[in-house]
């Protein structure tokens, strides 16, 4: 079952800044992302930012830059400009919308444990420390087992010169003792990405995520909606209207890494214009 | 939450007319844009006509001039005319509210959709 997940951090340098990460775990491509606060969308929240993976987005205040991390993921940096900071017990939600298969949204608040007169605010979360750990933690292991290896070697050319056939189980001996310590790296010599591959990287990335990228674990509610449906065209947004001057079937350009199959146009006969109106159903 | 029912769908011989309806409960906050998408079975589904928070209706060509949208805000119905019907307009027609990007139209919410057939 596709599932959302959300975090709420509070920024180290600024503790009037906060940032809300979400992420989709499914499969399926997203075709927009709802971000609200106060409750979820469409029953009293309010929106702080709308997604698309192809058309960009859209940001109320107090959102100061919202934005994609992933295929899959997005994150919302607010400025709380009042003293109280009014967001360390707000409700912030996200809503993954697949059209027309379904939406799933979930909702998340800033952990009592990062308040800021409690304890510091949490560190972001760790996806490319791990991938940096693993670095660290196999260039570590190579240069022990290298030195290590070097370090016998000089010790045998410093001994007085055995005879010409050393005992079957010395060479043994020191074959282990040499590469015993880099035993883990070795496989990562064959296979440089086997070690590098943090728990936040799915295993099959085909299988996981077909667009490869890292996800989260997450406790999720959804709303399923719409019957089954899927597709996939080289043209620009998933479930969206274009309006264009002469109406023409055209390709706007290339394609940003963001898949989304399936788009239609739309004449205008006024132009290209950007409505920041409001359609309120009540 | 937002609940959007359509209705009017059912088979009609090509040439024909169908009324679709909408009626749009809930609230959708800051949402700009109210359209028809249709799927057809085995092909690529496609916007069918939208209405800006301007009032200003917008058609996908293959539908201009046979297909007029409109909408009741007393009763917080959208609808959408079908006349001249042909079998490629076979489709389950679902009605959407949406966000603007631009002249986009992406939908945010939908109903489950009614079914359209266009067949002699």
């Known amino acids: 079952t596709p599932e959302v997940w959300v975090q709420v951090q509070m920024e180290a340098t600024e503790l009037s800044s906060f940032t809300v990460h979400c992420g989709f775990l499914g499969p399926g491509s997203i075709s927009l992302v709802t971000v609200s606060w106060g409750g979820p969308d469409g029953a009293g929240g309010t929106k702080l930012a709308v997604l698309h993976p192809e058309l960009g987005t859209r940001q109320w205040a107090p959102a100061r830059q919202a934005r994609w991390e992933t295929q899959s993921s997005i994150s919302l940096a607010l400025e709380d400009s009042g003293a109280s900071s009014p967001f360390a017990n707000t409700t912030f939600c996200c809503k993954f919308a697949s059209f027309p298969e379904g939406s799933w949204e979930s909702c998340g608040s800033l952990p009592p444990s990062s308040d800021p007169g409690l304890s510091a605010p949490p560190t972001p979360v760790p996806i490319l420390r791990a991938d940096l750990a693993g670095i660290l933690g196999l260039s570590g292991v190579l240069l022990f087992g290298c030195g290590y290896l070097l370090h016998l070697l000089r010790r045998q050319k410093h001994r007085p010169t055995p005879r010409l056939q050393p005992s079957h189980t010395n060479s043994q001996a020191l074959t282990a003792q040499a590469w015993a310590p880099s035993q883990a790296s070795q496989a990562a010599l064959h296979d440089p990405y086997a070690t590098i591959n943090t728990s936040f990287c799915p295993a099959t990335l085909d299988t996981a995520h077909p667009n490869g990228w890292a996800s989260l674990p997450t406790h999720a509610a959804h709303q399923p909606q719409g019957p089954a449906a899927s597709a996939s065209t080289p043209i620009l947004a998933r479930g969206s209207f274009v309006s264009v001057e002469n109406g023409l079937y055209t390709q706007a350009g290339e394609r940003p890494p963001h898949t989304g199959p399936g788009l239609t146009l739309f004449p205008d006969c006024r132009g290209p214009r950007a409505v920041e109106g409001r359609f309120g159903v009540r | 939450e937002v609940q959007l029912v359509e209705s009017g769908g059912g088979l009609v011989q090509p040439g024909g007319s169908l009324r679709l309806s909408c009626a749009a409960s809930?609230?959708?906050?800051?949402?700009?844009?109210m359209g028809w998408f249709r799927q057809a079975p085995g092909k690529e589904r496609e916007g069918v006509a939208h209405?800006?928070?301007?009032?200003?209706?917008r058609y996908v060509e293959s539908v201009k001039g046979r297909f007029t949208i409109s909408q009741d805000h007393a009763k917080n119905s959208l609808y959408l005319q079908m006349n001249s019907l042909r079998a490629e307009d076979t489709a389950v027609y679902y009605c959407?509210?949406?966000?603007?990007?631009?002249?986009?139209?992406?939908?945010?919410?939908w109903g489950q959709g009614t079914m359209v057939t266009v067949s002699s």
């Open positions: 209405i800006d928070s301007d009032g200003i209706p």
């Open positions: 809930g609230y959708t906050s800051r949402t700009d844009c």
């Open positions: 959407v509210v949406g966000f603007k990007f631009g002249d986009y139209c992406a939908p945010n919410d």
